[in-house]
Interface confidence: low
């Protein structure tokens, strides 16, 4: 003795990414010699048993038995979203509903607002926008491995009334360490299934130079050849160097090369040397105290750096 429920078809809700394929499966225990039918949200019949009713090549029959009717819809569009109805024409007609939710895939984000010639301690503001997501996607920012805290994602409905454009801004103060860094805006959305969809903006930061004097060899001795290298860093890289020997008034201006060369060291070369590295962002002066050691083989580290 069959209960009334045995003739009640059942199905399930489905979620599909736009452009993907969804399978609608309807099953019934007791078909009472009636065929199952699928219809779309506009109440157009798609399949009645194994007979195609709607001429749409995207819709294909998967399984048709007295107890099951399964169909697939490929290249699903946002317009395909809605309630699909499985019916069995018993007395009375029984139906089951399958809610098909179509996820809109967010577009690759677009970063705008980058202004070149940022200087150290300037404030940078970047904007990021991605259209086409459904439901609305979430945007996140990072600089290298560090998360940046941007504004909360703003959401705006797209003209089609189905998908959303999301946007976010981030503001941060730049440092010299940010020169060459990539600011990345990533879109997070269930349709991406964990895949990364992001856009990066490489930033350039102009900053004042620094310099360091490096002796070669590191422990100079009387009679040796010595090079003092003034290693300037900065953006832009320092283009001008000025060497001076302290103690003489005025200080002795020696060369404008980045390296100061002593072809043959004398004790009289001992003293404090300054190198001023200059770019159009400013200047930096590095010092080095040279103590010329005797030409003995015993190493000593009497030279000092500032």
């Amino acid at each position: 003795n069959l209960s009334q429920d045995d003739s009640q078809p059942w199905t399930s809700d489905e979620t599909v990414v736009a452009g993907g394929t969804v399978v609608l499966k309807c099953q019934v225990k007791d078909h009472e010699d009636s065929s199952l039918q699928w219809s779309n949200p506009a109440q157009q019949t798609l399949y009645f048993g194994e007979k195609r009713a709607l001429r749409d090549n995207r819709i294909q029959l998967v399984t048709s038995t007295p107890h099951e009717l399964s169909i697939s819809i490929s290249n699903v569009a946002l317009a395909d979203e809605g309630e699909y109805t499985c019916s069995i024409f018993t007395m009375p007609v029984r139906t089951a509903k399958s809610l098909v939710t179509v996820l809109g895939i967010p577009q690759k984000p677009i970063i705008t607002g980058y202004k070149s010639s940022l200087r150290e301690k300037d404030t940078a503001t970047l904007n990021c926008q991605s259209s086409g997501s459904k439901p609305a996607a979430r945007l996140t920012w990072r600089k290298g491995d560090q998360e940046l805290h941007g504004e909360p994602t703003r959401i705006q409905e797209d003209p089609n009334g189905k998908t959303f454009t999301v946007s976010s801004s981030v503001t941060f103060q730049v440092t010299r360490e940010d020169d060459g860094a990539s600011i990345v805006c990533s879109v997070n959305h269930e349709s991406l299934k964990g895949a990364d969809r992001s856009t990066s903006q490489r930033i350039e930061v102009l900053y004042t130079p620094t310099a360091m004097i490096r002796p070669d060899p590191p422990h100079p001795r009387e009679g040796q050849k010595l090079l003092l290298h003034c290693e300037g860093r900065g953006n832009p890289v320092p283009q001008q160097y000025l060497w001076e020997k302290e103690g003489s008034v005025p200080p002795l201006k020696m060369t404008q090369e980045s390296a100061l060369i002593f072809p043959f060291l004398n004790k009289s070369d001992s003293g404090t040397y300054g190198c001023t590295a200059t770019s159009n962002m400013g200047s930096y002066k590095a010092y080095y105290t040279l103590n010329v050691n005797d030409p003995s083989p015993v190493p000593s580290s009497s030279s000092t750096y500032h």
Epitope: A18, G19, N75, I105, Q107, K108, S131, D158
Partner: nanobody
């Protein structure tokens, strides 16, 4: 890796013509519809035109009808947009784009990969 590389923008006088190109790599070009989307200064994205995978079906926004022609050469994996009778309001960054699905996308949504954009300036 999907890449769309654009060329052909620039400055043109009102009434003049330009041809934009978009070379594709990293996917089977002939399997997918393609489209052009533009963004005028200070405005949102506006769909311009689309073409199906074979080139047999095309569609245009009202603002482009009769002046713009979309075409594709599947042997060269390249999409084109021929723009004639250009007007000042056509000034925008033009993006070529690949829809997420194989069906043409008649709107600015539904595209998953974008070219780098090319600026078209119409000014006298």
């Amino acid at each position: 890796q999907v890449q769309l590389v654009q060329s052909g923008g620039g400055l043109v006088q009102p009434g003049g013509s330009l041809r934009l190109s978009c070379a594709a790599s990293g996917f089977t070009f002939s399997n997918y519809a393609r489209g052009w989307v533009r963004q005028a200064p200070g405005k949102g994205l506006e769909w311009v035109s689309a073409i199906d995978y074979s080139g047999g079906s095309t569609n245009y926004a009202d603002s482009a009808k009769g002046r713009f022609t979309i075409s594709r050469d599947n042997s060269k994996n390249t999409l084109y947009l021929q723009m004639n009778s250009l007007r000042a309001e056509d000034t925008a960054v033009y993006y070529c784009a690949k829809p997420a699905s194989r069906r043409p996308s008649w709107d600015a949504d539904g595209y998953d990969y974008w070219g780098q954009g090319t600026l078209v300036t119409v000014s006298s």
